[in-house]
Interface confidence: low
């Protein structure tokens, strides 16, 4: 069956460059056309680039014209987008996509492949609790969590007592910092009557810093 | 450029419900007009195409019409596999312009959230930084409104807010909305306060705490 | 107004052999793809084959992929189809077409009348 495989996705300083490919099967790659399509983070879908079967003709969306180049390998089954000057908004999942055999719709979509551009440098998180008290109390329900803050680049991942507590449990999407870092909570609503005798762990990892941290939540000593 | 717009951006709906989007041309682009599903972090997958012609294995709950500027992709008895972000998209010229996306989300019924507040860790104040977090749980709809106020001095341009997927069991929204201050403008404040309101609310729901106290 | 004239069409016998053309008036091709469409009695018309811009060039149907050749002479403004090979199911009408888009969208502004092939023993 046809399959569209990406690669080449990652974190590009604003300026740099990066090559993405699309590795095609399951069809005859030459007689295709292929489109590039992006979604930034929480937004649309935003047409990018095409080249005809035979890559006589290209055309560009105005936002990356002169900046980007779309360029095809029918020996190898592959297309390329080539992102020069690149800039903070092309940060984006990049998606290429075959049309149906004439007609410009995409029936055929590859899994996507993610690119950051920032100029921050990868960084593993700080982890801080955030620790049950009256305050954080309502109705035999206590709630507590952890901070994840500062990393670069997306993503991390939270669980809770090695993944054995996941009831009540809310990871919030990561939200970027004005200093170009990462930021999430992780939080868990629990029986007030448990938190003198349950132990409450969150087990951060980073994966592109090698960061893993287990942080103990306990409700703050007066 | 063939500009595309869809309404609503948001459509709140139950299972076995008939729902409707629309999706407008900036000019006549005929029928060349195909529809699209995504699911968060998934790529999208083509419904339709030609305006109305069903794509292979793709149920016949979702029917397409419409020509020239208007058209509508409706969905005539909601599935719980249907709650999604939908696209249109042209292709009648070269740039092949998306319409900006509807999501289609579950009715659920009014949840007031359950707020707490939660201080800097001293972990954290030892770094410079105080973060202080207001949380939001399990409320519906989505809409809901945080204010900070330090020592009753409303707050702008120094939170940010964070709100999870619809969440698949009971339908409601958790938030987050955090405060970040240098530990020098933390120290200088005593009483912090984030002020909720919410259509589950009959009144603004305010938490909050004195710092250095427990 | 645009015109599109077809000719070329008749009988013929499988296996046998015919060339379509369809010349354009009040528009100049070169920057628009043109296609060829067919229609046999009682069916949807379908497409058969797009000849894109110049050096762009050409997609099939399956269905006729190897056995028809599309091909176009700008400066005659018109566009040919090359039916080799030809089997009873190409029994149709053959119309051509000329495209909205410079690229190719699949979106027709402009039809011509049909040429009716027939291919019988």
């Known amino acids: 069956q046809v399959q569209l495989v990406q690669s080449g996705g990652g974190v590009v300083q604003p300026g740099r460059s990066l090559r993405l490919s699309c590795a095609a099967s399951g069809f005859t790659f030459s007689r295709y056309t292929i489109h590039w399509v992006r979604q930034a983070p929480g937004k649309g879908l935003e047409w990018v680039a095409v080249m005809s079967y035979n890559g006589n003709n290209k055309h560009y969306a105005d936002s990356v014209n002169g900046r980007f180049t779309i360029s095809r390998n029918d020996s190898k089954n592959t297309l390329y987008l080539n992102m020069n000057s690149l800039r903070p908004e092309d940060t984006a999942v990049y998606y290429c996509a075959r049309i149906r055999d004439t007609a410009m719709f995409f029936a055929h979509w590859g899994q996507g492949t993610l690119v950051t551009v920032s100029s921050a440098s990868t960084k593993g998180p700080s982890v801080f609790p955030l620790a049950p008290s009256s305050k954080s109390t309502s109705g035999g329900t206590a709630a507590l969590g952890c901070l994840v803050k500062d990393y670069f680049p997306e993503p991390v991942t939270v669980s809770w007592n090695s993944g054995a507590l996941t009831s009540g449990v809310h990871t919030f999407p990561a939200v970027l910092q004005s200093s170009g870092l990462y930021s999430l909570s992780s939080v868990v609503t629990v029986p007030s009557s448990s938190l003198g005798t349950q132990t409450y762990i969150c087990n951060v990892n980073h994966k592109p810093s090698n960061t893993k941290v287990d942080k103990k939540v306990e409700p703050k000593s007066c | 450029d063939i500009q595309m717009t869809q309404s609503p951006s948001t459509l709140s709906a139950s299972v076995g419900d008939r729902v409707t989007i629309t999706c407008r041309a900036s000019q006549s682009i005929n029928t060349w007009l195909a529809w699209y599903q995504q699911k968060p972090g998934k790529a999208p997958k083509l419904l339709m195409y030609k305006a109305s012609s069903l794509e292979s294995g793709v149920p016949s709950r979702f029917i397409g019409s419409g020509s020239g500027t208007e058209f509508t992709l409706t969905i005539s008895s909601l599935q719980p596999d249907d709650f999604a972000t939908y696209y249109c998209q042209q292709y009648n010229s070269d740039s092949k312009m998306f319409g900006q996306g509807t999501k289609v989300e579950v009715k659920g019924t009014v949840a007031a959230p359950s707020v707490f507040i939660f201080p800097p860790s001293d972990e954290q104040l030892k770094s410079g930084t105080a973060s202080v977090v207001c949380l939001l749980n399990n409320f519906y709809p989505r809409e809901a409104k945080v204010q900070w106020k330090v020592d009753n001095a409303l707050q702008s341009g120094n939170s940010q807010e964070s709100v999870t997927e619809q969440d698949s069991k009971d339908s409601t929204y958790s938030l987050s909305s955090t405060l970040t201050l240098s530990k020098a403008d933390y120290e200088k404040h005593k009483v912090y306060a984030c002020e909720v309101t919410h259509q589950g609310l009959s009144s603004p729901v305010t938490k909050s705490f004195n710092r250095g106290e427990c | 107004q645009v015109q599109l004239q077809e000719s070329g069409g008749g009988l013929v016998q499988p296996g046998g052999s015919l060339r379509l053309s369809c010349a354009a008036s009040g528009r100049t091709i070169s920057r628009y793809a043109m296609s060829w469409f067919r229609q046999a009695p009682g069916k949807e018309r379908e497409f058969v084959a797009v000849?894109?811009?110049?050096?762009?060039?050409?997609f099939y149907a399956d269905s006729v992929q190897g056995r028809f050749t599309v091909s176009r002479d700008d400066a005659k403004n018109t566009v040919y189809l090359q039916m080799n090979s030809l089997k009873p199911e190409d029994t149709a009408v053959y119309y051509c077409a000329i495209d909205s888009d410079t690229f190719y969208s699949g979106s027709y502004d402009y039809w011509g009348q049909g040429t009716q092939v027939t291919v019988s023993s």
């Open positions: 000849a894109r811009r110049s050096g762009d060039g050409a």
